[in-house]
């Protein structure tokens, strides 16, 4: 519009006039007037400030605390705050990733459908017709059942979702 | 101290372009639209458009469309001036200038309060 | 465009004498004014926004006044360094255009 109907994108409006806000980094010391600039100062060690600010201090840095099972993914600098993550075998309770939890396990019966990361669980599914699992895992699929086909074998035991089938040799005495 | 620290002068023949800087310190660069202003040999002011150094948006005066183009460099606070098909009357010297608003009665009123000192280009076969 | 006239456009005057130039705009511009001073070889400086408001660090012997289309620039005391060329430049339309000036010069 013209001309102007607010202050421009990367300004405040303070005692009558339009000032600079301080850039990502920085933190506001004081404000612009008639006679001076906006004055403004780095962030200091292990703080920062992500967007264009009048902020008078700067945001601490997030602390990756291992008693929680959390670990740094990303240094944080002075325009962006830290990314934690979990320890091998965790992930985060939650999208900030303030604490971890022990990846969870598919019982027997179920599969791995995706493995677990750092940010989110394992993901089970039951194992179809024709697939087993037979152990509690976070890594392991279900597995196909044996073909006893393939083997020159016959079923003796059927399979269960748990359970592989059990093949045994053919009866000879059929014709 | 704000100060706005132009390239020197030039000569060019009819027909090139020019491309005239403006390096600004003493203030956040990208906190203030730039803008280009001329002034022919004896001649009055005659403004050619503007840049918002943030996003490196411009908006060029109607008589200057096709012909201007203004450009920024933020990482080293420099805004940027090209005119190209040079005629003899470009001849002029060229300006940049800062955009202060100032706020009263409801209204928000800008002006130029901090100029370059200015980049003669001739124009001339 | 908005046509910006200044009157007089050649003013010779003396040290000490009250000086008052005359800017008029095509078209209403409320109080979207200003008044530059330019000497010669040098960048235009602001003295004057908002048609009235005085620029930091300009003398107290400049004012401003008007608004719509009749606008005045005063010096009540003119000193030796007030001799120069005066602008008006209207910021409300695009382009924002300046008037085509008023030289000062010592009679």
């Known amino acids: 519009p013209e001309p102007p109907t607010a202050c421009r994108e990367k300004q405040y409006l303070i005692n009558s006039q339009c000032c600079s806000l301080c850039q990502p980094g920085q933190k506001l010391v004081s404000d612009c007037t008639e006679f001076t600039e906006t004055e403004c100062l780095p962030c200091g060690e292990s703080e920062f400030l992500d967007t264009w600010n009048r902020e008078t201090h700067c945001h601490q840095h997030k602390y990756c605390d291992p008693n929680l099972g959390l670990r740094v993914q990303q240094k944080g600098t002075s325009e962006t705050d830290t990314i934690c993550t979990c320890e091998e075998g965790w992930h985060c309770t939650s999208e900030a990733c303030e604490s971890c939890v022990l990846h969870r396990s598919c019982s027997p019966g179920f599969g791995v459908k995706q493995i677990a990361t750092g940010v989110s669980d394992t993901i089970c599914e039951p194992c179809p017709v024709g697939f087993f699992s037979n152990v509690s895992s976070a890594f392991e699929k279900c597995h196909p059942w044996t073909s006893c086909e393939t083997k020159d074998l016959v079923v003796q035991q059927a399979g269960t979702n748990k359970t592989d089938v059990v093949c045994g040799p053919q009866d000879r005495l059929r014709a | 101290q704000v100060q706005l620290v132009q390239s020197g002068a030039e000569v060019k023949k009819p027909g090139a372009s020019v491309k005239v800087s403006c390096k600004a310190s003493?203030?956040?660069?990208?906190?203030?639209?730039m803008y280009w202003v001329r002034q022919a040999p004896g001649q009055g002011l005659e403004w050619m458009g503007w840049i918002n150094p943030d996003s490196g948006a411009p908006t060029y005066a109607q008589k200057f469309q096709g012909r201007v183009t203004m450009t920024r460099d933020t990482s080293i606070s420099t805004a940027y001036m090209e005119l190209s098909r040079l005629r003899s009357d470009d001849t002029a010297v060229y300006y940049c200038?800062?955009?202060?608003?100032?706020?009263?009665?409801?209204?928000?009123?800008?002006?130029?309060?901090?100029w370059g000192q200015g980049t003669l280009v001739t124009v001339s076969s | 465009d908005i046509q910006l006239t200044q009157s007089p456009s050649f003013l010779s005057a003396s040290v000490g004498d009250r000086v008052t130039i005359t800017c008029r705009a095509s078209q209403g511009i409320s109080s979207y004014l200003a008044w530059y001073q330019q000497k010669p070889g040098k960048a235009p400086k602001l003295l004057i926004y908002?048609?009235?408001t005085l620029q930091s660090g300009v003398p107290s012997r400049f004012s401003g006044s008007g608004s719509g289309t009749e606008f005045t620039l005063t010096i009540s005391s003119l000193q030796p360094e007030d001799f120069a060329t005066y602008y008006c430049?209207?910021?409300?339309?695009?382009?924002?255009?300046f008037g085509q000036g008023t030289k000062v010069e010592i009679k």
């Open positions: 430049q209207q910021l409300i339309s695009y382009p924002w255009t």
């Open positions: 200038a800062r955009e202060k608003i100032y706020y009263g009665s409801g209204n928000y009123y800008p002006s130029f309060d901090y």
């Open positions: 003493g203030y956040t660069f990208a906190g203030y639209y």
């Open positions: 908002a048609a009235s």
